[in-house]
């Protein structure tokens, strides 16, 4: 049937409308045309549409299809990016609690050691922090350097203070004798275990969100291919040419184009939904040594444990040092000789999982039940796309790229757009490099979750043990187990409120214990002071 | 005998750069951390930041922070300080220190005049 | 602007006693050792006193620290001519760094 002729045979209403696209009306024709140079639009009859004017059409569509792509990925993107943000804030919010733990342990129990004890303190947990955002760095070669730098400053000042002056330069043989003698028993080991696991996870944890954002930030702002431009025009605005201004596409005809344009981009959906999915089995295990926040935050109770471990020991390892390293003893060890040994507790020190705060755990749970939500996000965006964009209801006129019709099926439309333009063409090129460069590193992270999602079981370290590890504290749990004896001075008594805390960060006066005068009961405090309270910015 | 050499003295214009180097002989260089304090003329002494020369591990002070880079050559047992951004207030003495066992800094080099001047 | 803070000149005459004063916070000389430097006219600075009151070898006993809350002082007894010199106090601060005072120059009359 042929079309209905433009209502305005003066293509005025056309050039109204084509005018707020493009000022001025040089391109317009004033009357209907034949059309005959129209690549997009082709007309069955007179049309008001120019060369020019299809050309701009097509630019239009490709930037309306921008828009509409990055307004459809806008929650998920800000919902990335707020936690990824959160999130490192959070981790270094927990590196520099721990820090400051293990500066108050050392301040209250082990004067003598400080300040060198500070910079060793300082160094590790600086490496820990540049660990986490995914510097180049060993974890054992950090923990073997903090154990190093102790044990020199532990023998003069503490084991052996009565050394002079000119004995003090045994220190290298002093760091060379803390390994060959392992002086510090298994707990350098236990330590580098824990970190290593925990650093491990948090850094993956963090690479993935970061990822998330640039798989979205690839997809945002992807640039439409010139045939998708075609039938976008041809979608969008061909009606126009006809003079008919108010029609909307065909639903089913819109879906059909945008999976044409998004073929590329629904390539993702299948890694999309890994990605999310062993992102959740990464988060489900981040618990115990698999906790950076459990883990650091006990690390003060550990490092404590390791020195009274060398103290247990000072009188034999005094003896055999003197002889490697070539100076003469000058005071047998006593154990009450500095006040160092006073604030001893052997109560055991576990950080507790109160599962009615927010902590870093439950917002973790949380973001993961969110992401779910966004788990069909690429397969969905066609339709997402079309219901928001205008559309025609199913029991109304359509346009379905060609003409009005009264409802809109594939078949008519493949009959309506023979030797125009091929969809199964366009969807048979495949997705963008920039596309396929991205579901590359879906594919690489998703490996990497894959791999260090944790064994569900109590398989866990259990070579701990067999390696003779002398902290009867722990039972037989190992993974369970954040150091041994607590310090007596320091107790953790719940996990940080992060998200209350991220309103107003604590500086070392605030970590438990700060005082050298301080008694044993004086320092059961909690580990913050009373935080319940405090706004979260995050909710 | 334990001693540390310091590079000579240097005159610099504002927005340059200077390297000062701090040379370690008489003990094991890679086992103890090496400070940086300055002293401009006739003022107290500010202590710029540390290097774990075994590491290569770095501590800055807050004020010097993005404007200073403390480095180590292990294999000749020298540590080096740089400052960048250079202003007429960073004329001053600069110094190595190591920090000994004890927690002082119990070995300081002879000191090195930096002159920023345009 | 230093951070702790000692006079900027003292003096008495030789064979009396001297004490310099050092005044901190509770995060510096409050929770922390405080060490003291002599430093020569012309020379770098030479440890004097370290850990609150504790002397390295070589150093007089006319020389002695204490410390008592956020406050240290040197007591120099038996003052002699060589003594002439400035004398900075020294403490690790909780922000993370090394503080020292403005220094006290001290002139043996």
């Known amino acids: 049937q042929p079309p209905p002729p433009p209502p305005d045979a003066t293509c005025h209403q056309v050039r109204s409308f084509f005018q707020r696209l493009q000022p001025g009306l040089k391109w317009v024709p004033e009357t209907p045309v034949p059309g005959s140079d129209l690549q997009v639009c082709l007309p069955k009859g007179p049309t008001c549409c120019s060369r020019k004017m299809e050309e701009k059409y097509q630019l239009t569509a490709r930037l309306n299809m921008e828009q509409l792509l990055q307004s459809a990925s806008m929650e998920l993107k800000f919902l990335i990016i707020q936690n990824a943000a959160v999130f490192q804030e959070a981790f270094e919010i927990v590196v520099r609690h721990a820090k400051n733990y293990t500066n108050a342990m050392f301040k209250n129990n082990y004067p003598s050691l400080t300040p060198q004890a500070f910079e060793f303190v300082g160094e590790f947990f600086t490496d820990v922090s540049l660990y986490i955002l995914g510097s180049d760095i060993n974890v054992d070669d950090m923990v073997n350097e903090l154990f190093d730098s102790l044990f020199p400053v532990i023998y003069t000042q503490l084991m052996n203070p009565g050394l002079p002056d000119s004995a003090l330069d045994i220190n290298e043989c002093l760091r060379g004798a803390r390994r060959d003698l392992k002086v510090f028993g298994n707990f350098p080991k236990l330590i580098m275990t824990q970190v290593s696991k925990s650093l491990q996870v948090t850094r993956i944890f963090l690479q993935a969100l970061n990822l998330g954002i640039e798989v979205i930030n690839t997809t945002d702002h992807l640039k439409f291919s010139k045939d998708c431009g075609r039938m976008l025009t041809r979608m969008w605005y061909c009606s126009y040419c006809q003079g008919l201004m108010m029609v909307k596409p065909c639903g089913g005809y819109c879906n059909v184009v945008m999976q044409g344009c998004m073929a590329g981009v629904v390539e993702i959906d299948k890694y999309w939904r890994e990605y999310i999915l062993s992102l959740e089995e990464l988060v489900n295990g981040m618990y115990r040594i698999y906790d950076m926040e459990n883990v650091l935050l006990g690390l003060f109770s550990t490092i404590h444990d390791s020195i009274q471990y060398v103290q247990k020991n000072a009188g034999k390892l005094t003896t055999t040092i003197g002889k490697l390293c070539a100076h003469s003893q000058q005071r047998q060890y006593r154990s009450a000789y500095y006040p160092e040994d006073l604030f001893i507790d052997k109560k055991v020190l576990k950080v507790a999982h109160v599962e009615h705060e927010e902590t870093l755990s439950s917002r973790r749970r949380e973001l993961i039940q969110k992401l779910k939500s966004f788990i069909s996000f690429y397969s969905a965006l066609p339709g997402y796309i079309c219901s928001h964009s205008p559309v025609a209801e199913n029991d109304t006129l359509c346009w379905n790229g060609q003409e009005l019709v009264e409802r809109y099926s594939q078949k008519a439309a493949r009959n309506g757009m023979k030797n125009q333009f091929n969809l199964h063409e366009l969807k048979m090129k495949g997705p963008e490099p920039v596309v396929s460069q991205i579901i590359d590193k879906l594919k690489h992270i998703n490996q990497l979750l894959r791999t260090m999602s944790m064994p569900k079981g109590r398989v866990l370290d259990k070579n701990l043990d067999e390696e003779g590890f002398e902290s009867g504290d722990c039972g037989d749990d190992e993974d369970e187990c954040i150091g041994g004896s607590g310090d007596g001075m320091i107790k953790v008594k719940n996990q940080l409120r992060f998200l209350a805390e991220l309103a107003y960060d604590l500086d070392v006066d605030d970590a438990p214990g700060n005082s050298q005068q301080a008694t044993p009961k004086d320092n059961e405090i909690s580990t913050f002071h009373n935080l319940g309270n405090v706004h979260s910015p995050l909710k | 005998q334990m001693q540390l050499v310091q590079s000579g003295a240097e005159v610099k214009k504002p927005g340059a750069s200077v390297k000062v180097s701090c040379k370690a002989s008489?003990?094991?260089?890679?086992?103890?951390?090496m400070h940086w304090v300055r002293q401009a003329p006739g003022q107290g002494l500010e202590w710029m930041g540390w290097i774990n020369p075994n590491s290569g591990g770095t501590n800055y002070a807050q004020k010097f922070q993005g404007r200073v880079t403390m480095t180590r050559d292990t294999s000749i047992s020298t540590a080096y300080m740089e400052l960048s951004r250079l202003r007429s207030d960073d004329t001053a003495v600069y110094y190595c220190a190591r920090r000994g066992l004890r927690g002082d800094f119990d070995y300081w080099g002879q000191g090195t005049l930096v002159t920023v001047s345009s | 602007q230093s951070v702790l803070t000692q006079p900027p000149s003292a003096s008495e005459t030789p064979g009396q006693k001297v004490t310099i004063s050092c005044s901190g916070s509770s995060s510096n000389i409050g929770t922390n050792h405080v060490f003291w430097y002599q430093q020569l006219p012309g020379t770098a600075p030479k440890l004097l006193i370290y850990?609150?009151?504790l002397r390295p070898s070589g150093v007089p006993d006319r020389f002695s620290g204490s410390k008592s809350g956020t406050s240290a002082s040197l007591a120099i007894s038996g003052l002699r001519s060589e003594d002439e010199a400035d004398y900075y106090c020294a403490a690790w601060d909780d922000s993370l760094s090394w503080v020292f005072g403005g220094g006290t120059k001290l002139t043996v009359l």
């Open positions: 850990r609150n009151n």
């Open positions: 008489g003990y094991t260089f890679t086992g103890y951390y």
